[in-house]
């Protein structure tokens, strides 16, 4: 009897949907694997007789409740199927947005870039998929624990009237208010303000 794949799980970030599993111990030789998806009550092959322990399901419709399954195979024998269910639009992890930061005197000017979705023909971002897409920004004075959060209205934000010659750190994440779902924070970007440009009267 061929043992089934172990620890079957979906690793999905920004709709890059990779079904992953581990090869079970099997004394007779090397196992291969077949992974399938369900479409209209018929299972269709996605990865056939692969020696890999993952299969790319990124092309699944983002909106379906999908049933995926994988089994191990050796010669003419095979294991039972291991099934998982997956709804990309609900289950995918929202990766960190990009962020550009520029210092202008005592202000930090930030521009945010929604994470890209891989597609052969178009440049789509997570913002195209989620209507309620917005950003959370948190910033703090470097070396302190107190953090301030803001929710920009647009793809850019300006932090004004900061202390001059002080290093501030900023990070951003995607947020979906209608789902109360937050994405991953970007890596902090730390920049030092310069002087206050206001001219004394």
């Amino acid at each position: 009897m061929v043992p089934p794949p172990e620890n079957v799980r979906m690793n999905s970030v920004n709709f890059k949907n990779i079904l992953q599993w581990e090869s079970p111990a099997f004394a007779k030789g090397n196992l291969t694997f077949t992974a399938q998806y369900l479409s209209y009550r018929i299972f269709q092959d996605k990865c056939m007789n692969t020696t890999l322990t993952e299969c790319d399901f990124s092309s699944l419709s983002k909106y379906g409740d999908h049933t995926l399954r994988v089994r191990a195979e050796f010669a003419d024998e095979h294991s039972d199927w291991v099934n998982i269910t997956f709804c990309p639009v609900d289950d995918t992890i929202i990766g960190p947005p990009g962020m550009q930061v520029e210092v202008l005197a005592d202000s930090l000017h930030m521009r945010f870039l929604a994470p890209k979705i891989e597609n052969e023909y178009e440049t789509w971002t997570m913002k195209n998929v989620y209507n309620s897409w917005t950003y959370n920004v948190q910033y703090w004075k470097n070396g302190t624990d107190e953090k301030f959060q803001i929710t920009p209205q647009y793809d850019f934000e300006v932090l004004r009237n900061l202390e001059p010659w002080t290093t501030y750190c900023v990070q951003v994440r995607g947020f979906l208010p209608d789902r109360n779902k937050a994405g991953e924070w970007s890596e902090p970007v730390c920049e030092q303000t310069t002087h206050d440009e206001t001219v004394p009267s």
């Epitope: 998806y37 479409s39 209209y40 269709q44 983002k62 909106y63």
Partner: nanobody
């Protein structure tokens, strides 16, 4: 089995245009990728275009820039606008739905009634 109803085929001169339509059930329309594939006599099925529920599209290289796939959400209807038609576009065109949005996945679906497109030079 999913019910899809194609229409809009016909005969045109090279360089002409046609718009194909496909009516689908609401469940199919919202939960699956929709697409078109075609089959010319004696030839393999060829995927043409697909569209996900949010409007993300994919096109076969042979039709890119000439064909446009779109959806009318209110009518649960899929369209294929075909411009600058060529004689090699002559085929039976089929509407399809699949959980997978690739061009290739559409071609694995059962054949419906289809709609004939004939382009003469």
């Amino acid at each position: 089995q999913v019910q899809l109803q194609e229409s809009g085929g016909g005969s045109v001169q090279a360089g002409g245009s046609l718009r194909l339509s496909c009516a689908a059930s609401r469940y199919t329309y919202n939960s699956y990728c929709m697409g078109w594939f075609r089959q010319a006599p004696g030839k393999e099925r060829e995927g043409v275009a697909t569209i996900d529920s949010d409007g993300m599209t994919r096109y076969a290289d042979s039709v890119k820039g000439r064909f446009t796939i779109s959806k009318d959400n209110a009518k649960n209807t899929l369209y294929l606008q075909m411009n600058s038609l060529k004689p090699e576009d002559t085929a039976m065109y089929y509407c399809a739905a699949d959980a997978d949005c690739t061009i290739a996945a559409m071609t694995t679906n059962p054949l419906g009634q289809g709609t004939q497109v004939t382009v003469s030079s």
